[in-house]
Structures are given as structure tokens and as C-alpha cells.
């Protein structure tokens, strides 16, 4: 049996964010069992976790991971130096900031040490796999009696991020959402002083520095207005 698999991941880019290849094998054996797919995410460009589903193996196997950067000064093959474990079996590798080169093609190879010919290689565009930390320090201030402005901070270069703001009142069943660019501020032009509003924000590494699809976690919510005080409808509370 002679197989080579080339599968684009479809991370919404014109060229795939990774290609998966398995080594050709000549006989039906454990070598022909496909290795699990490796998924990598770069967290705020501080560290990267590359993980795989270790339970997909027919028997518990400590798969090994090697990586390098294609066509670059960093093309020397590196061994994973910090494995992640699931029930005492390797299930991932963590790379630190200095080992992350966002704009070079990252090549990751998973291998079964008991069957060295059983290996799979993927190529990833790390700039499309960045997940920023959730926005912090949400603040609200009144621009006028009926207009509110929401501001927040991110722990990354502002121009690299876009944002999604969601808000609703206690009377709403669903969130209203609004996209916000790198300027990281949002205005709500018409606020009902009788209602209590909740706001939250998440961020994404897109489109100026990369083309990531994954959003950060939601920020802690912040609230405005009062559903208790009828005398002073413009009393407001801030909660982080």
C-alpha cells in the first residue's frame, strides 16, 4: 500500500494553513494507521500549544513531536522540550515565545517512536492561529445623557486586533453585537436610563497582522444603569 495524504485544513485562507502528509508504507501494518491531527494555537504570541488526541491511538503511545521552520534560518529540526500529557501519555507540546516565528512556515512532525516510519507532517501558518488574551479593564463613560462610550485594553499591539462587542439589557433575550476595528472603542448612541445594560468584548488577530479565525475568550462583563433606582435613572454602576 502506497499512500500520501495532502489535505488542506480550510482555515479560510487562499493557501491552506496546514498540509498533512504521511510517509508511504509498503505493507498493511501499524505503520498504515493514520496519526492524529496536530492542532496548534499561539496564545497572545507568548507561548504555543500543539496538541493531538492521544486517545485515538489503538493502544497508549507516547508519540513524539519535532518541528522546524521551512525555508528560513530556523530550519534545523528541533525536538519538543516541553511535552503536555493526558493520563501520562504525551498529548501535546508547548513552545515558548523565543521558539515562535509567526511569519515563517511552521512544520510540525508527529512520530510513533516504536514505528519510526509511521509519521505525519503538517505545515502551518502561525499568524493565522493566534488567539489573544481576553480584553481587560472595560470602562464606560457618558458622552451625553443618552450616549455611552465603552473602552477596553488588550495585552497586545492594538492595530493587530479587531473586536466584537455584545450588549443587552435585562429585558433582552439575546445579545446585540457590533464589530469594532483596532481603535478599540464603542459608542452606544441611545441608552434607556430605566434599563440595566451588560457589555462584553472579545478580540481576534485579524486582519492587519494575520488572518486568525478564532476569537479570544469573552471579557468579564461590565454593567451600566440601575434596575433598582426609579428616582435616579442615570445612576450607574461599574463592575469588572
Amino acid at each position: 500500500l502506497n499512500t500520501t495524504i495532502l489535505t488542506p485544513n480550510g482555515n479560510e485562507d487562499t493557501t491552506a494553513d496546514f498540509f498533512l502528509t504521511t510517509m508511504p508504507t509498503d505493507s498493511l501494518s501499524v505503520s498504515t494507521l493514520p496519526l492524529p491531527e496536530v492542532q496548534c494555537f499561539v496564545f497572545n504570541v507568548e507561548y504555543m500549544n500543539c496538541t493531538w488526541n492521544s486517545s485515538s491511538e489503538p493502544q497508549p503511545t507516547n508519540l513524539t513531536l519535532h518541528y522546524w521552520y521551512k525555508n528560513s534560518d530556523n530550519d534545523k529540526v528541533q525536538k519538543c522540550s516541553h511535552y503536555l500529557f493526558s493520563e501520562e501519555i504525551t498529548s501535546g507540546c508547548q513552545l515558548q515565545k523565543k521558539e515562535i516565528h509567526l511569519y515563517q512556515t511552521f512544520v510540525v512532525q508527529l512520530q510513533d517512536p516504536r514505528e519510526p516510519r509511521r509519521q505525519a507532517t503538517q505545515m502551518l501558518k502561525l499568524q493565522n492561529l493566534v488567539i489573544p488574551w481576553a480584553p481587560e479593564n472595560l470602562t464606560l463613560h457618558k458622552l451625553s445623557e443618552s450616549q455611552l462610550e465603552l473602552n477596553w485594553n488588550n495585552r497586545f499591539l492594538n492595530h493587530c486586533l479587531e473586536h466584537l462587542v455584545q450588549y443587552r439589557t435585562d429585558w433582552d433575550h439575546s445579545w446585540t453585537e457590533q464589530s469594532v476595528d483596532y481603535r478599540h472603542k464603542f459608542s452606544l448612541p441611545s441608552v434607556d436610563g430605566q434599563k440595566r445594560y451588560t457589555f462584553r468584548v472579545r478580540s481576534r488577530f485579524n486582519p492587519l497582522c494575520g488572518s486568525a479565525q478564532h476569537w479570544s475568550e469573552w471579557s468579564h462583563p461590565i454593567h451600566w444603569g440601575s434596575n433598582t433606582s426609579k428616582e435616579n435613572p442615570f445612576l450607574f454602576a461599574l463592575e469588572a
Epitope: 504570541v45 515565545k97 516565528h101 509567526l102 511569519y103 515563517q104 499568524q127 485594553n153 495585552r155 497586545f156 499591539l157 492594538n158 492595530h159 493587530c160 483596532y182 492587519l208 497582522c209 494575520g210
Partner: nanobody
């Protein structure tokens, strides 16, 4: 909070010198591509210089006259500008990119992505 704060601009005669400073907070300059852009009256945002992945790039119009440097202990980036010309008149913006962005990926940038900038005026 991530911030870039420029200083050191001013007015100078042609042939004079200025040294711009950019103080970085909320991230580490050493982990980033750091550089300077400028925008002259009625002009587009123009890359002046940037350090990326160990290499430094300069616009042809400033080569041999401008020098970028960095003090990692102070998290500060400098732009030494010598032999200034009237055509160097612009607002100068300190810029930061993810490490390796410019040398591997770079694209056109708007000057308003970063700080407020510092005005440099060169009279003949």
C-alpha cells in the same frame, strides 16, 4: 495597556540634527519589530526605518543620515536624524509589529495605527 509615546520632535534648520525617542509600555520592544514611519503634509504614510528579525531597513531617502537604535533596559527606541532636509518635515510615528512581520510578511501601514506622533519641521 500597550502604548507607544514619541518625543524629541521640534524645529531645526536644514543640515541640523534631532533625536527622537519612543517609550514603549505594555509590551517588550525586544520581542517586536520596532521602527518609525512619517507622514508629511499631503503625503501618504511612509516607512522610514524598521528593525525586523535582526535586519534593519531604511527608506532610500534617509539612508546614511538616519539611524535607529534601541535600549532594551529602558524599553525605548530612538531615531537619530542627521543632515536634515526640508523634505524630512513630517509627523514621525513610532511603530511596533509582531516580531518578524516586516521581513517576512510586511504590508502597507497607516500612520494612525500607533501613537500621536511627534512633529519635525526642517526649514531651509
Amino acid at each position: 495597556q500597550v502604548q507607544l509615546q514619541e518625543s524629541g520632535g521640534g524645529s531645526v534648520q536644514a543640515g541640523g540634527s534631532l533625536k527622537l525617542s519612543c517609550t514603549v509600555s505594555g509590551f517588550t520592544a525586544d520581542d517586536s519589530d520596532m521602527g518609525w514611519y512619517r507622514q508629511g503634509p499631503g503625503n501618504e504614510c511612509e516607512l522610514v526605518t524598521i528593525s525586523s528579525d535582526g535586519s534593519t531597513y531604511y527608506a532610500d531617502s534617509v539612508k546614511g543620515r538616519f539611524t535607529i537604535s534601541q535600549d532594551n533596559a529602558k524599553n525605548t527606541v530612538y531615531l537619530q536624524m542627521n543632515s536634515l532636509k526640508p523634505e524630512d518635515t513630517a509627523v514621525y510615528y513610532c511603530a511596533a509589529e509582531p516580531r518578524g512581520y516586516y521581513s517576512n510578511y510586511g504590508g502597507r501601514r497607516e500612520c494612525n495605527y500607533w501613537g500621536q506622533g511627534t512633529q519635525v519641521t526642517v526649514s531651509s
